[in-house]
């Protein structure tokens, strides 16, 4: 058993049917030594009596706020939370895996520069009674400080018969270089409580590994005189790291067809310009990606060709 | 500690084409024993991550952008100092942190030529005969020391005695060649950061 | 006491189905994972399929995805596996077992798929 | 298909030790707990260590289990007549837990 915060504690147990549980000793936080009786949630039901109250936890019925009370005044309160490890592995049952970019990937996370900071999300079916606490360090023996804000619910869609919740969470470095090489991950830690049952779900990277750079900006057409040849242009976009002749970008250009069979012309560039071919009714994409590093490319910024 | 913002004369810089080069062929090296030592641990995640120049050259915070010295976090470094007789860019106007920054880059690929060699002695040891170091990113290191042309003591390649461990050889090659890969990116930055300049 | 008794084996032509059970008793059935795993005749044990406790996700082996569904009803303590499309190599003793550290096997049931 | 390779059979006299391996990979057995069943012939598998080492109540205890690296071990320390059967490794993959590899099985037979 150990202590998630003040007055709530988590039992580990290893879950199997019929297996002992794990013996707890709850102690009452007062100076007083007799009349002391103990309730478990809601019910009146008195389970002992005493400073120190001994139960075996066993299952989810075991778990609960134990109240401990003298004369009809309540005296402390202790939250027992259940982690349930199943054959050598933790549960983890409150977040879906989100098998992108492998399999048990239960938390992901991208940054649109080298800046240090960098947004964390994750999945799950389940609406209330639901809380998460999101803590991060650079390291973990000798961990260097990572500030995260409060996880919020950011998205809800509509999966087949489920409805699924996206939580997403902010994270700064509190001394990054974007120039500086990486030899330590970031660490990202998320507790999830859901009624009874806590979970702990974890993500190590490295910023470079989950660059995604925002879309190129101020995507422009000029037609060339007597050609069927644009020249396409475009800017690196607000939030990318400067300067830009040290954190370069590549681009990909696409000319895309109306219909997804159509085949697309593509062009890779290092510049913000490109001359291509416009199609009636084709559109131009480009996306960006860091040039040295290869994580992963922006989203397309499109404009019609027409 | 950092690139001033020069303006040196067009088309000078010989190195960008060469750090490119190097950047590819470094990759391509990686991805190789990655496929390659597919039972072995040599995926980002598996690996620990040391750099064999930590605390003998400080190439990222001499070859920091002006633009990036305002930065606190980027000024903590260690001090080190070179020699500065570059011929990387071939105009006069050479400054003195821009030479520390070379010959910073220098050091750092002559430490990586002596430790891939060593490495590779080793590797054509092996009975298996898994996995051997890629002879043109050999080439593509010496070809960019040799645009850079600084002048230094010839570091002797380590022999060593005792059998070697293959299996330890491996791991450790990975572990170089991520770190390679990590600084080779750091160089093309810088390269391409002087050729803007 | 925990207790898995299954039922539903038996003789079946191949590209006919048929459903296997497994009562649950002696614990509280709606809080484990369980799976069912297979041994045709002379050979080794082959794991077939896995559903959580609530039933929210299910796993199977590539040899059966796509034919066999596993199932639970909570409410009934029983946990069943569906073999559609059977085949004369699905012929094999199933048993069905509890998820854990320390697991409970059900007795078996013998399913001969053959024409 | 099986990940977990062990040899088909070994044999030993009474008293003999007799050691059983499952050999995996940095995915499975490197990465998660392994457990042994023992299972007689007509009946089901029975648990004899989980958690690569421990033995669960009832399990006599010349009945050891070992890890190290991508290989685990059961040994039967002085091995007896009704200790004939045969024995599986069990173990998961670290990408599709909750999906259960189970080794190739090995035939133990007690001479004389």
């Known amino acids: 058993i150990w202590e998630l915060k003040k007055d709530v504690y988590v039992v580990e147990l290893d879950w199997y049917p019929d297996a002992p549980g794990e013996m707890v000793v709850l102690t009452c936080d007062t100076p007083e030594e007799d009349g002391i009786t103990w309730t478990l949630d809601q019910s009146s039901e008195v389970l002992g009596s005493g400073k120190t109250l001994t139960i075996q936890v066993k299952e989810f019925g075991d778990a609960g706020q134990y109240t401990c009370h003298k004369g009809g005044e309540v005296l402390s309160h202790s939250l027992l939370l259940l982690h349930k490890k199943e054959d050598g592995i933790w549960s983890t049952d409150i977040l879906k895996d989100q098998k992108e970019p492998k399999n048990k990937t239960f938390l992901r996370c991208e940054a649109k520069n080298y800046s240090g900071r960098f947004t964390c999300w994750w999945l799950t079916t389940i609406s209330t009674d639901l809380t998460f606490s999101v803590k991060s360090s650079r390291g973990s023996s000798d961990p260097q400080g990572v500030t995260c804000g409060a996880a919020t619910l950011s998205a809800e869609r509509v999966r087949g018969d489920n409805k699924e919740y996206e939580y997403s969470v902010e994270c700064q470095e509190d001394s990054a270089c974007p120039a500086a090489e990486e030899s330590l991950p970031i660490e990202v830690m998320v507790d999830a409580v859901h009624k009874l049952k806590y979970e702990n779900y974890t993500s190590s990277f490295f910023i470079r590994d989950i660059i995604k750079p925002d879309p190129p900006k101020n995507l422009q057409l000029k037609p060339l005189k007597n050609s069927r040849q644009v020249e396409v242009s475009w800017e690196y976009p607000d939030t990318w790291s400067t300067p830009h002749s040290y954190f370069s970008l590549t681009f990909c250009v696409q000319v895309q067809g109306k219909s997804k069979r159509e085949k697309k012309d593509r062009v890779f560039t290092d510049k913000t310009s490109a001359t291509v071919i416009c199609r009636k009714n084709a559109s131009i994409s480009v996306r960006a990606q860091d040039r040295y590093y290869s994580s992963s490319w922006s989203e397309w910024a499109s404009v019609p060709c027409s | 500690r950092n690139l001033p913002v020069a303006t040196p004369d067009p088309g000078m810089f010989p190195c960008l084409h060469h750090s490119q080069n190097l950047l590819r062929a470094v990759s391509n090296m990686l991805q190789k024993a990655r496929q390659t030592l597919e039972f072995y641990p040599c995926t980002s995640e598996e690996i620990d991550h040391e750099d064999i120049t930590k605390d003998k050259t400080s190439t990222v915070e001499a070859c920091l952008p002006l633009e990036l010295t305002k930065n606190e976090s980027c000024l903590n470094s260690r001090e080190t100092s070179f020699i500065t007789n570059g011929s990387c860019l071939a105009s006069r106007k050479t400054s003195f942190m821009m030479a520390l920054c070379l010959s910073s880059i220098y050091e750092d690929l002559k430490m990586y030529q002596v430790e891939f060699k060593t490495m590779n002695a080793k590797l054509l040891m092996d009975p298996k005969r898994q996995i051997f170091l890629d002879q043109n990113m050999l080439a593509v290191i010496d070809e960019l020391m040799q645009a850079l042309n600084f002048n230094s003591e010839t570091v002797p390649q380590k022999s060593s005695l005792e059998e070697p461990d293959f299996y330890k050889t491996k791991i450790k090659l990975c572990i170089l060649l991520h770190a390679f890969r990590i600084r080779a990116v750091t160089i093309d930055r810088v390269m391409s950061y002087l050729n803007a300049s | 006491q925990v207790q898995l008794v299954q039922s539903g084996g038996g003789v079946v032509q191949p590209g006919r189905s048929l459903r296997l059970s497994c009562a649950a008793s002696g614990f509280t059935f709606s809080s484990y994972g369980m799976h069912w795993v297979r041994q045709a005749p002379g050979k080794g044990l082959e794991w077939v399929a896995f559903i959580r406790y609530d039933g929210s996700n299910k796993y199977y082996a590539d040899s059966v995805k796509g034919r066999f569904t596993i199932s639970r009803d909570n409410s009934k303590n029983t946990l069943y596996l569906q073999m559609k499309s059977l085949r004369a190599e699905d012929t094999a003793v199933y048993y069905c077992?509890?998820?854990?550290?320390?697991?409970?096997w059900g007795q078996g049931t013998m399913v001969t798929v053959s024409s | 298909s099986y990940v977990l390779t062990q040899p088909p059979s070994v044999s030993g006299t009474p008293g003999q030790r007799v050691t059983i391996s499952c050999s995996g990979g940095?995915?499975?057995?490197?990465?998660?707990?392994v457990k042994w069943y023992q299972q007689l012939p007509g009946t089901a598998p029975k648990l004899l260590i989980y958690g690569n080492d421990q033995r669960p109540s009832g399990v006599p205890d010349r009945f050891s289990g070992s890890k190290s690296g991508t290989s685990a071990s059961l040994a039967i320390t002085g091995v007896q007549a009704e200790d004939e059967a045969d024995y599986y490794c069990?173990?998961?993959?670290?990408?599709?837990?909750?999906?259960?590899?189970f080794g190739t099985g090995t035939k133990v037979t007690v001479l004389g």
């Open positions: 077992k509890t998820h854990g550290s320390h697991d409970n």
């Open positions: 069990q173990s998961y993959d670290r990408g599709t837990h909750p999906l259960t590899m």
């Open positions: 940095r995915s499975n057995i490197g990465s998660n707990t």
